[in-house]
């Protein structure tokens, strides 16, 4: 006879249910958003539900299919490209990831006009990168590491470079290190407004030391990868930026831009480039010791069809406390005169601003101040700045939108977003179409996320675009974990904190505590957005309060706390994280026997270092992908916070803040330690040499490696990676399965 | 395979204007991969580029001629032209009219060249 | 604009003997350079491109070599029919320009 509970009739409470681990796998609380994809002042294209792409007028309230599904289908298409004449779209499909932002695959063009695939100089497969031009209908493409350009779909290609090699020479996208840590796209290309030039970055990785790892697959003998990668303190890609005139192609070679003397006399990267009008470019450089950064506007010298860059027209960024900018140099937003432009960078009090500069970066007029952070600029039309930033209410994890009036004096600003949803949507973000005529918000929480279209004059919502009802009502009876965002102040330092506790949460018991941590310079965790993922499940059904804390070195609170981690990576940040532990004990329903930590990638360097702390706060913990020593990370990041692992420089520190010196003090603490043999970002190595430092210290610890996985740890073995960590945690809480 | 042929008169007076035809033969002056372009060679001398022509009809001028020169294509009769006004003893040369490939491949088509004397 | 200098002028050899032409740039024209012969009365020939690559049917006696300033024609056995005038022309930079030439002479 088995006995079953009676349910109460009615009761709220009985017909809801916790959240399950399998909710959080199968993505049955995901949301959607909508980002129009904009192709004119009023217009926008959407891939519909079943796959036709619909090309919307805000202003007549028609819609009509450009391009059916059917089409798509023929090619297995995943993805499009209106030409900006519209005269034909190109479709992407066999897609292959290479790395964060990088894959390549087959394009087909297809003519709008005639309703047939474009025969005849087809392109070659795959291809790396395809862009139209932003005017008419070129193509510029990347295929096997060289550029070509088709003046019309169907015309041969000219080519451009020559001299692309796998691995060696890259011309118009990144190298490894450029894509990850620098440009943070697939591509580096850019046409001028018109269409008129094509600038290139050309990455020589000749020189560079190559980090080579088994990919096993189901061959009898594994693959080796092999790909360029600067570590910290390695011969770094040379980059040299060309420009193409792409009405008379290929006839005298690319022009090289020259780089400003300053930034030339040592080595340097190239940070961005931006075109400010057809016979205008504005690039920015960076000093390899990142706290230099040189912002040079070029301009085309028609007699020689040369590039020339005055001394008088660089700008040079310095920081005097850590590196130039946030996670990168920010990128200049010009304004109508084509020569003055708005800038994110410091203040005089340590917080980032927006800046207009019209003649020198001295005499920088501010336009936003106080103590929090302008976080970017979206767009600057005659009489209006767009920009986000976390002023409101003095909530650093928030994101809202406002408006400043440049066009009248004093300009006056306007918070768009502020008041719209204030208790759904408090952090946002926006797209623009053609000078700001409409644009669209989307809200990403914390409340459930919603998509919304505006008057860019105005401002009025003209309508929501998407507002997850399936996922509100799927939501109904879930027993979903409470959030609340706090600080906590110590020492003069605030630590902003969100907790999250499970659904019945009363103040008088006692939980487990787990702490999820990233901790990375110009992070930010502790951000008000929506989220039902894995330690949402955590708290509604095994009864964790989980706290994500932004420390020292995180972003957004200004330059003190931001730069105080400059050249000492892996102090204050563990430090933060203990103080706000202690603190979370302090509150009186935390079992301080049953503390865990855990993180992935940077957050899986600072749980080792919380666990290895030797402060016997943590029971347990949990550490993905982690990075153990900073000798075996990227150049272009780890220098940027620690400057050269040389002894006249900071070697020192990169030897004190290794995992691996600190291998005893993992003797106290239940350690799992997690990572796919094909990262190629942190790499196996990291783990290889913190297993063989525990091993060698007699030190017992789990482990668990996936074969052939990158450092996202994705597909199947997500599935199987959250439910070995369930199992660890529960294990380590005495939680019973 | 292709073939440049030159054509025009052989003696043009100080002051006028020197016209020359390229008629292209075994391909298309409309191939988005070539350019079109003339080079002279004064008497007992070197090698000069004058200037040239893309399909779309975008020209390209050697600046120390700039002033006087027009290069147009006829897509139609699978020609392109030169003229350089307000001649003068010194641009008497051999003019050959090329297929220029860009600046990777170079002009690998040459015309045989025609004989142009400025003299009155 | 740039000035692309040849040297010898005058290269005096026998047939069977190896030459030697040379080009230098007034600035760094990268591999952007070509070679050409031509023969009296006759249009020049494409004999290189991008400093180093033989054009379609030229003879393996022919090779490129040199890049940014300073680059280098040879002739590995001279045939007869190799007596004639050599150009190199530059286009890495506006506008294209040619050197001199060098003759190669019977001796």
């Known amino acids: 006879i088995v006995l079953r509970p009676s349910r109460v009739h009615n009761s709220e409470e009985n017909t809801m249910r916790a959240l399950t681990l399998k909710d959080i796998l199968n993505g049955t609380f995901s949301y959607k958003t909508f980002f129009p994809n904009w192709i004119s002042g009023q217009e926008y294209l959407h891939q519909s539900a079943d796959n036709n792409i619909v090309l919307y007028n805000i202003e007549t309230g028609q819609s009509y299919t450009i391009l059916s599904n059917r089409t798509m289908k023929s090619v297995n298409a995943s993805n499009y490209g209106l030409s900006p004449d519209r005269q034909f779209v190109y479709l992407e499909s066999d897609y292959s990831k290479l790395w964060r932002y990088s894959y390549t695959a087959t394009y087909y063009i297809y003519d709008l006009s005639n309703g047939e695939f474009v025969r005849g100089n087809e392109l070659p497969r795959p291809i790396q990168y395809l862009c139209w031009s932003p005017v008419g209908s070129k193509l510029a493409y990347v295929y096997q590491n060289n550029i070509y350009l088709k003046q019309r779909p169907g015309d041969p290609p000219f080519q451009i470079t020559f001299n692309g090699r796998e691995n060696k020479i890259f011309n118009g996208i990144p190298d490894w290190v450029y894509e990850e840590e620098m440009l943070a796209t697939k591509y580096a290309l850019w046409w001028s407004p018109n269409g008129k030039f094509l600038a290139y970055a050309e990455f020589n990785d000749t020189d560079i030391p190559v980090i080579a790892y088994s990919y096993y697959g189901d061959e009898q003998y594994p693959r080796t990868i092999n790909i360029p990668y600067p570590k910290a303190g390695a011969k770094n890609p040379v980059v040299r930026i060309f420009i193409i005139d792409t009405t008379y192609p290929a006839y005298v070679g690319p022009q090289e831009v020259p780089v400003p003397a300053m930034i030339a006399s040592s080595d340097y990267y190239f940070s961005w480039l931006t075109w400010v009008t057809d016979e205008r470019v504005c690039l920015q450089w960076l000093k390899r010791v990142q706290n230099v950064s040189v912002l040079s506007i070029c301009d085309f010298r028609e007699d020689w069809q040369t590039w020339d860059c005055p001394k008088t027209q660089e700008h040079i960024e310095e920081s005097r406390t850590g590196w130039a900018g946030g996670f990168f140099v920010s990128t200049p937003v010009f304004s109508y005169d084509a020569i003055s432009y708005y800038k994110i960078f410091s203040d005089k009090d340590g917080y980032k601003h927006i800046h207009y500069i019209k003649d020198t970066v001295e005499n920088a007029i501010q336009i936003t101040s106080g103590k929090w952070e302008a976080i970017n600029i979206f767009r600057v039309t005659q009489d209006s700045l767009f920009y986000s930033s976390n002023e409101f209410e003095e909530y650093p994890g928030r994101r809202n939108i406002y408006r400043i009036s440049i066009g009248s004096y004093p300009p006056s600003k306007k918070c768009v977003t502020c008041h719209l949803r204030k208790e759904r949507c408090q952090y946002y973000t926006a797209s623009f179409s053609d000078y700001a005529k409409y644009y669209a918000l989307v809200c990403y929480g914390p409340g459930i996320p919603i998509s919304t279209l505006h008057d860019g004059r105005t401002d009025q919502e003209i309508k929501i675009l998407e507002e997850n009802k399936e996922l509100e009502n799927a939501l109904k009876n879930i027993q979903l974990p409470k959030e609340e965002i706090k600080k906590l102040e110590v020492d003069e330092i605030t630590l902003w904190y969100k907790m999250i506790l499970p659904p019945q949460f009363d103040r008088s018991k006692k939980y487990p505590l787990l702490i999820q941590v990233y901790g990375g310079p110009c992070s930010q965790s502790v951000r008000s957005v929506f989220a039902v993922n894995w330690i949402s499940y955590l708290a509604s059904k095994e009864g964790m309060v989980i706290a994500l804390v932004d420390g020292r070195g995180t972003a957004f609170q200004g330059d003190k706390l931001l730069y105080a981690v400059y050249r000492k990576l892996g102090v204050y940040e563990v430090e933060d994280q203990i103080t706000a532990v202690r603190k979370f004990i302090e509150m009186g329903f935390i079992d301080e026997k049953r503390i865990a930590i855990w993180g992935w990638s940077y957050g899986g360097y600072v749980s080792s270092l919380a666990l290895a702390s030797g402060t016997g706060l943590f029971k347990c913990g949990i550490a993905v992908a982690p990075v153990s020593s900073w000798e075996y990370y990227a150049s272009v990041y780890t220098e940027r916070f620690m400057g050269l692992p040389t002894k006249d420089d900071n070697l020192e520190h990169y030897k004190n803040s290794t995992v691996m010196a600190r291998a005893e003090y993992f003797r106290n603490v239940d350690y799992l330690l997690i990572h796919g043999t094909a990262d190629d970002n942190v790499h196996f190595q990291n783990s290889a040499q913190i297993a063989k430092a525990l091993v060698n210290a007699q030190v017992d610890f789990q482990a668990m490696w996936y074969s052939d996985q990158n450092h996202g740890l994705s597909g199947l073995s997500t599935n199987h990676l959250y439910t070995h960590m369930t199992h660890f945690l529960k294990q380590c809480f005495s939680l019973s399965d | 395979q292709l073939q440049l042929q030159e054509s025009g008169p052989g003696l043009v007076k100080p002051s006028e204007t020197l016209s020359l035809t390229c008629t292209v033969s075994?391909?298309?002056?409309?191939?988005?991969?070539?350019?079109w372009g003339w080079i002279r060679q004064p008497p007992g001398k070197g090698l000069e580029w004058i200037g040239s022509i893309y399909y779309s009809g975008s020209t390209n001028y050697n600046p120390s001629l700039k002033s006087r020169v027009t290069i147009s294509v006829d897509t139609s009769k699978n020609q392109f032209s030169l003229k350089l006004r307000s001649v003068t003893a010194a641009d008497t040369a051999v003019y050959y009219c090329?297929?220029?490939?860009?600046?990777?491949?170079?002009?690998?088509?040459w015309g045989q060249g025609t004989t142009v004397t400025v003299s009155s | 604009e740039i000035v692309l200098t040849q040297s010898p002028a005058t290269l005096s050899l026998s047939p069977g003997e190896r030459a030697t032409l040379s080009c230098r740039a007034s600035?760094?024209?990268?591999?952007?350079l070509a070679w050409y012969q031509q023969k009296p009365g006759q249009a020049p020939r494409l004999l290189i491109y991008?400093?180093?690559n033989r054009a379609t049917g030229i003879p393996a006696r022919f090779s490129g070599s040199g890049s940014g300033t300073d680059f280098t024609l040879t002739i590995s056995s001279l045939e007869p029919e190799d007596f004639a005038v050599y150009y190199c022309?530059?286009?890495?930079?506006?506008?294209?320009?040619f050197g001199q030439g060098t003759k190669v002479e019977i001796k």
């Open positions: 991008d400093a180093s």
């Open positions: 075994g391909g298309s002056i409309s191939s988005s991969s070539s350019y």
């Open positions: 090329v297929r220029d490939k860009g600046y990777y491949y170079g002009m690998d088509v």
């Open positions: 022309q530059q286009r890495s930079n506006w506008p294209p320009t």
């Open positions: 600035q760094s024209v990268s591999s952007y």
